[in-house]
């Protein structure tokens, strides 16, 4: 058993049929010595008396808010949560496996630049009685500071018969140099509590590996005389690291109709303009990627050919 | 401790091409190592990230773009002194700071070159003959060093009398290649910045 935060404790249980469970001793936070009784949640049934209460925690029915009273007055609370371990593996029931970039990916993180700011998000089908707490650091043995905000519900989607909820959090490394060469990864830890179930999820990454630039901005077309070719130009996204001659991007320019199966024109360039063939009912799209370290491509920025 | 804007005229910077070749060669070699050594811990997640140039050179700090010198987090640099002549400078108005930057890059390359050559000698003794260093990568390191053209003491190639542990050598190769790729990215960024300035 360990303390998650003040008056909230996590009991780690091996979860299998007829498991013996964990013996837990609760102590009432009071100078009083006698006349103390214990109850669980909203029940008025007295579970025991005295300054300490010993319980055997085996299942969710044994978890909850234990309260010690004296003469009708509440003295203190202890909330017990369960963390299940099945076949030596901690449960991952609360969050959905996003399976990208590999199986057992529950947290996904992206950074728009090298400033040390990044966003992580996760998915769940649970809509109520759900809380998240996020901590982060650079390295684990001698951790350096990363400050994370509160996790917020950022999107709701309908997937078949189920609703899916996306939560996200923004974090900022306390003293980040955009030009630094990372040797210690960023560690992100998410505590998830659903009703009386506790789970924790972790992700470890280098900022350089989670870079995904914003789409290029200000796409413009200039038709070339006596030709089907058009010159398309664009600019670096505002959120990208500066100076751009140091943090350079490379671009992919594509002309395509509405269907992905349609024919297309595609060209890669390090410049902020390119010449392509425009077709009726097609769109010109441009996306960006770090020129020197191939992490993710940005989303497409698009303009219609016409 | 930074690169000023008064740098060589555009198109007068011969090292850019070599640095692009370097990054390409290292990336290819790392990819080959990851494929060939698929049953060894050779991915970015599996290896320890070590920098053999730590406390010996300070390329990131010495080559910091002017725009980032306002960022205090970028300025906790180590003081290192370097030789200050080199052909990539290509301009009389080149500053001392830039010479410091380029000589730091040269020292990085020299250190990695020695490590790679020592390691290749060990790998050539491996009866499995599983992996060797790409001669193209070694040649590209050499070309960039020649383009930088700094005078520097020769670092003797390390020789070891004991029987090499090939498993450890291959893991060290992975560690070295990952670190060198990261440094090659920095070198490419620096050369691009200097070329554009």
């Amino acid at each position: 058993i360990w303390e998650l935060k003040k008056d909230v404790y996590v009991v780690e249980l091996d979860w299998y049929p007829d498991a013996p469970g964990e013996m837990v001793v609760l102590t009432c936070d009071t100078p009083e010595e006698d006349g103390i009784t214990w109850t669980l949640d909203q029940s008025s049934e007295v579970l025991g008396s005295g300054k300490t209460l010993t319980i055997q925690v085996k299942e969710f029915g044994d978890a909850g808010q234990y309260t010690c009273h004296k003469g009708g007055e509440v003295l203190s609370h202890s909330l017990l949560l369960l963390h299940k371990k099945e076949d030596g593996i901690w449960s991952t029931d609360i969050l959905k496996d996003q399976k990208e970039p590999k199986n057992k990916t529950f947290l996904r993180c992206e950074a728009k630049n090298y400033s040390g700011r990044f966003t992580c998000w996760w998915l769940t089908t649970i809509s109520t009685d759900l809380t998240f707490s996020v901590k982060s650091s650079r390295g684990s043995s001698d951790p350096q500071g990363v400050t994370c905000g509160a996790a917020t519900l950022s999107a709701e989607r309908v997937r078949g018969d189920n609703k899916e909820y996306e939560y996200s959090v923004e974090c900022q490394e306390d003293s980040a140099c955009p030009a630094a060469e990372e040797s210690l990864p960023i560690e992100v830890m998410v505590d998830a509590v659903h009703k009386l179930k506790y789970e924790n999820y972790t992700s470890s990454f280098f900022i350089r590996d989670i870079i995904k630039p914003d789409p290029p901005k200000n796409l413009q077309l200039k038709p070339l005389k006596n030709s089907r070719q058009v010159e398309v130009s664009w600019e670096y996204p505002d959120t990208w690291s500066t100076p751009h001659s140091y943090f350079s991007l490379t671009f992919c320019v594509q002309v395509q109709g509405k269907s992905k199966r349609e024919k297309k024109d595609r060209v890669f360039t390090d410049k902020t303009s390119a010449t392509v063939i425009c077709r009726k009912n097609a769109s010109i799209s441009v996306r960006a990627q770090d020129r020197y370290y191939s992490s993710s491509w940005s989303e497409w920025a698009s303009v219609p050919c016409s | 401790r930074n690169l000023p804007v008064a740098t060589p005229d555009p198109g007068m910077f011969p090292c850019l091409h070599h640095s692009q070749n370097l990054l390409r060669a290292v990336s290819n070699m790392l990819q080959k190592a990851r494929q060939t050594l698929e049953f060894y811990p050779c991915t970015s997640e599996e290896i320890d990230h070590e920098d053999i140039t730590k406390d010996k050179t300070s390329t990131v700090e010495a080559c910091l773009p002017l725009e980032l010198t306002k960022n205090e987090s970028c300025l906790n640099s180590r003081e290192t002194s370097f030789i200050t002549n080199g052909s990539c400078l290509a301009s009389r108005k080149t500053s001392f700071m830039m010479a410091l930057c380029l000589s730091s890059i040269y020292e990085d390359l020299k250190m990695y070159q020695v490590e790679f050559k020592t390691m290749n000698a060990k790998l050539l003794m491996d009866p499995k003959r599983q992996i060797f260093l790409d001669q193209n990568m070694l040649a590209v390191i050499d070309e960039l060093m020649q383009a930088l053209n700094f005078n520097s003491e020769t670092v003797p190639q390390k020789s070891s009398l004991e029987e090499p542990d090939f498993y450890k050598t291959k893991i060290k190769l992975c560690i070295l290649l990952h670190a060198f790729r990261i440094r090659a990215v920095t070198i490419d960024r620096v050369m691009s910045y200097l070329n554009a300035s």
């Epitope: 070719q229 199966r261 024109d265 | -």
Partner: antibody, heavy 118, light 107 residues
């Protein structure tokens, strides 16, 4: 299986024209760009131009502009390349090639030898 | 026009040995570079697109690398069926242009 089958060899006099055909099978004809590339004896490959069979749009290499015409007949899934004012240096194998991507070629025809000789 | 220069023009190789063909562009073409194999009397075959993207159905012994002006096609271990002429082609700008070709011959 996508295939491009070209017409047979031709012998032409200088100053005349030649029209080579390229019949496509497998896949929808108008879903692909169609290009013509030639190879003179002992020489490398030379791109001549492309057509979008869907709308008849064409683009030609400046070297052939005014002498080459590329057309396409959707009903027969056939593309044609006509080269006029033939000279002896036009003696070459003419190949058609296609792809959904405009700028490179994933399927090639077997080639048609055109000999220009007086 | 962008001029593509291949080297060597002839490459004698022992079967089972690796082979590398170089292609250089007269100006930077990013990764807009494709490789083809051609055998006498046969249709050409696309091997690699955009400098390093492998093509479905092409054996994994063929790989490509490079960007900017310098590109390489590598055959890790030459098989008897690989003796042919190889061409690079740039797609950075029109007109599309090819290298002169490299003939890989049995040593």
């Amino acid at each position: 299986q996508v295939q491009l089958v070209q017409s047979g060899a031709e012998v032409k006099k200088p100053g005349s024209s030649v029209k080579v055909s390229c019949k496509a099978s497998g896949g929808t004809f108008s879903d692909y760009y169609l290009h013509w590339v030639r190879q003179a004896p002992g020489q490398g490959l030379e791109w001549m131009g492309w057509i979008d069979p869907e709308n008849g749009d064409t683009e030609y290499a400046p070297k052939f502009q005014g002498r080459v015409t590329i057309t396409a007949d959707e009903s027969t899934s056939t593309a044609y390349m006509e080269l006029s004012s033939l000279r002896s240096e036009d003696t070459a194998v003419y190949m058609c090639a296609r792809n959904k991507e405009l700028r490179y070629f994933d399927v090639w025809g077997q080639g048609t030898l055109v000999t220009v000789s007086s | 026009d962008i001029v593509m220069t291949q080297s060597p023009l002839s490459l004698p190789v022992t079967p089972g040995e690796p082979a590398s063909i170089s292609c250089r562009a007269s100006q930077s073409i990013s990764i807009n570079l494709h490789w083809y194999q051609q055998k006498p009397g046969q249709a050409a075959r696309l091997l690699i697109a955009f400098a390093s993207q492998s093509i479905s159905g092409v054996p994994s012994r063929f790989s490509g690398s490079g960007s900017g002006t310098d590109f390489t096609l590598t055959i890790s271990s030459l098989q008897p069926e690989d003796f042919a002429t190889y061409y690079c082609q740039q797609s950075n700008s029109f007109p599309l242009t090819f290298g002169q070709g490299t003939k890989v011959e049995i040593k």
